[in-house]
Interface confidence: low
């Protein structure tokens, strides 16, 4: 399937002009490479009418060209001063021949239609409504006025000002006068449709005096915007619709053969196929609202339809919005795993990928909640503080540069299963979504921590060892101490694990931390974990509390930290850089202005990085050490 | 940053002119049609004049033609309107648009970005 993409089918009238926007994958060889403009003929032959090698034809002198925009993935043919002989096959399409890479365009130019010298035109969206005007002389003000619509052998009334209403109209049409002009009667059409488009007549009075008006009323529907992504990245629906359906239940569909199968809705509908990857957003008062796809999949390219009805549903009459949307399989993003799997009382690393282009940006983990429109309460951030709920069990570990990083979650318990989404507050289509299934255990963990219930005493030394199997010997492993801006890693030295050994004894296995001497800042969580260069793997929490010497421990240690309510948080995800697309000089606020934190971004994010140096001034030293023990029986 | 700079604006009699021009930057001004539209107190925003990118094609409302005449200059980067005959119902706010290109000259969904507007009021 080519990678190519642009409008499938492009219509205009005689004398009128176009522009064919065509996009391509994101690669310098795509940048630079020559695109072209080709009509296709009955032979197959794809005959070249304008490149960017700067190759003009014959029939395209003067009023054409064809400009390409590196910086945004796409080139844009414009022909102006169309005729009938334009209508045909076209490909737009990159490579030094035209049997490169390529899109088919069909390209339909009609006549312009014949209408009556004194005809006005009116040219409105689906949806909308038109306010007919038609003038009358002084002598016709008392007499009937009414508006028809032609047909082809009559002209069929709509409405007249003594009340009688073509059924097709009740409700829509109204035929009123404004103020005291009696020169100029109006008539108002709302819910406008296809079937409304065509030649009307107004009338005041009758017979040879009457006064007659011809109207031609266009009937559009909305143009699809087109929307090139890549897999697995996202996509934002913008959807402007007005302030007539602000208070209306809004909706977003994908056409399907003759119908529009609701996506996700304002009441609560959503296509389980879309479930944790999709949010709905409210925008204003003013009819706006968006709707983000992460998790992009081959089968989501189609053509999608925005409305409100209060319903929820898509309904004739009523305003929409259009786009047709290409999903890209020459992806930049990395292939990850969307499934993880843990066990309850263990823990999960998650890989989270971003544009490494963006490596200051700041990163965030969110988890998708289903209720309402759906949203994503950021639960940890590179500059965003842990949520109080997962104290002690979850952190982010940023690796700057290398377009990961990972976000590990320990001590899970059946409730954490869900969906999570990774984004950062650059390039919002490397937003990822992550699917945790947590099953119960059925066997010992990977790492244990002796002692479990750990209360050390002030100023005395205090040490607590990490077990793990034989198969991380080769890992490193590592403590850290937990706070809610992240898990410090404390220094480590490796004590025998590097020495060469025949057997590993599973029974032996152990990294150790020592606490000399024990202070009150002691207090807290504490991470034992493997990792694989700056690839995270599994681990384990614990609790130390630290008691005075001379009196029992008042401390009440947290022998669950799962047990904890959970808090129902109402804020959602903030993303100052979502909006996709301003449609506006005057810029439009981000679609998800009313959120929480992310807004007050520096340029520079301040970075939460793991970091090693964790010894402190008063001489207190903090180790841990791996051990590899020999026993003799 | 597309932005649209709209001038010209002020009272003038019926009858009388006034050429009201556009300051477009941050866009590929060449490619796109450009388009004015207006909005009168309590109406609706409705299209005046649109042209072509390269100048070849232009559309009039019926209510403007053979009294007003768009133009542009792609070196200068600017669009014109040059409004002759005013009448008193010609009075609103004159918004300069940039074009979709999405072959709709005179519908407002055709224009994605506006400038804020400069005021022509005719008196009688």
């Known amino acids: 399937k080519s990678p190519i993409f642009g409008p499938q089918e492009v219509s205009s009238i005689e004398g009128d002009s176009v522009s064919i926007t065509c996009y391509y994958p994101d690669t310098s060889v795509n940048r630079h490479t020559r695109k072209y403009w080709c009509r296709q003929g009955a032979s197959g032959m794809c005959t070249t009418l304008i490149s960017s090698n700067g190759y003009l034809s014959k029939e395209y002198s003067g009023r054409a060209n064809l400009i390409n925009f590196p910086e945004n993935n796409t080139f844009v043919i414009n022909i102006e001063q169309l005729t009938q002989d334009d209508t045909g096959s076209y490909k737009c399409g990159l490579g030094t021949s035209n049997r490169g890479l390529s899109f088919d365009v069909s390209l339909e130019v009609s006549q312009v239609p014949e209408l009556p010298s004194d005809t006005h035109v009116y040219t409105k969206d689906i949806g909308r409504n038109v306010t007919i005007e038609c003038p009358f002389k002084r002598e016709n003000a008392p007499s009937k006025k009414s508006l028809c619509k032609k047909t082809n052998q009559s002209c069929e009334l709509v409405i007249d000002s003594t009340e009688k209403v073509n059924p097709s109209y009740i409700g829509r049409a109204k035929l009123f006068m404004k103020g005291t002009d009696l020169t100029v009667f109006y008539v108002n059409i709302s819910h406008l449709t296809h079937n409304d488009a065509g030649l009307y007549i107004c009338q005041a009075g009758e017979g040879p005096s009457a006064d007659k008006k011809n109207v031609d009323l266009q009937v559009l529907a909305p143009e699809p915007e087109l929307l090139y992504k890549d897999l697995r990245s996202s996509v934002t629906f913008e959807c402007d619709l007005g302030r007539e359906v602000a208070n209306e239940a809004k909706y977003l569909c994908r056409m399907n053969k003759e119908t529009c199968d609701v996506i996700i809705n304002t009441l609560g509908k959503r296509d389980p196929d879309f479930e944790g990857r999709i949010l709905i957003t409210p925008k204003d008062d003013n009819g706006r609202f968006s709707v983000l796809i992460t998790g992009l999949r081959k089968e989501d390219a189609g053509h999608y339809q925005c409305g409100a009805h209060s319903s929820g549903l898509p309904q004739e009459g009523w305003p929409i919005q259009t786009w047709q949307l290409f999903v890209n399989e020459e992806s930049t993003i990395p292939n990850r795993r969307s499934v993880v799997k843990g066990v309850t009382g263990g823990s999960v690393a998650i890989a989270c990928p971003y544009n490494p282009k963006e490596s200051s940006s700041l990163k965030y983990w969110c988890r998708w909640e289903g209720d309402g429109n759906g949203h994503c309460p950021v639960l940890v951030g590179t500059q965003a503080q842990v949520q109080e709920e997962y104290e002690g069990r979850l952190a982010l570990f940023d690796q700057p540069g290398n377009g990961t990083y990972t976000v590990i979650l320990n001590q899970l318990t059946t409730e954490d299963a869900g969906f999570y989404w990774c984004l950062t507050n650059g390039d919002s289509r490397w937003r990822t979504t992550i699917e945790l299934q947590v099953a119960e255990a059925t066997r010992e963990p990977n790492l244990e921590v002796t002692p479990q219930n750990a209360t050390a005493v002030l100023g005395e030394t205090f040490t607590v060892s990490c077990h793990y199997p034989c198969k991380f010997y080769s890992q490193e492993k590592y403590w850290c101490k937990w706070s809610n801006k992240g898990c410090h890693i404390l220094p480590s030295h490796d004590e025998g694990a590097r020495q060469s050994s025949v057997s590993c004894d599973q029974s032996s296995q152990l990294v150790s931390m020592t606490l000399n001497p024990v202070s009150k800042e002691d207090e807290g969580w504490y991470w034992c974990g493997v990792k694989q260069g700056q690839t995270y793997g599994e681990t384990t929490a614990i609790y130390i509390a630290v008691e005075e010497r001379t009196r029992g421990s008042s401390h009440v240690n947290p022998t669950d930290a799962n047990a904890r309510a959970k808090v129902a948080l109402e804020e959602e995800v903030v993303d100052s850089s979502i909006s996709e697309k301003e449609n506006k000089a005057i810029p439009n606020p981000g679609p998800f202005a009313n959120e929480r934190e992310i807004q007050n971004v520096g340029d520079q994010a301040q970075e939460n990085r793991a970091s090693g140096d964790a010894g402190s001034a008063d001489g207190q030293s903090r180790s841990s050490s791996s051990k590899h023990h020999h026993h003799h029986h | 940053q597309v932005q649209l700079v709209e001038s010209g604006g002020g009272l003038v009699q019926t009858g009388g002119s006034l050429r009201l021009s556009c300051a477009a930057s941050?866009?590929?001004?060449?490619?796109?049609?450009m388009g004015w539209f207006r909005q009168a107190p309590g109406k609706e925003r409705e299209f005046v004049a649109a042209i072509s990118w390269g100048g070849a094609s232009t559309w009039y409302a019926d209510s403007v033609k053979g009294r007003f005449t768009i133009s542009r200059d792609n070196a200068k980067t600017m669009v014109y309107l040059q409004m002759n005959g005013l009448k008193p119902e010609d009075t609103a706010v004159y918004y300069c648009?940039?074009?979709?290109?999405?072959?709709?000259?005179?519908?407002?969904?055709?224009?994605?970005?506006w400038g804020q507007g400069t005021l022509v009021t005719v008196s009688s």
């Open positions: 941050g866009l590929t001004f060449s490619s796109y049609t």
């Open positions: 648009a940039k074009g979709r290109n999405n072959g709709y000259a005179t519908a407002v969904r055709a224009y994605d970005y």
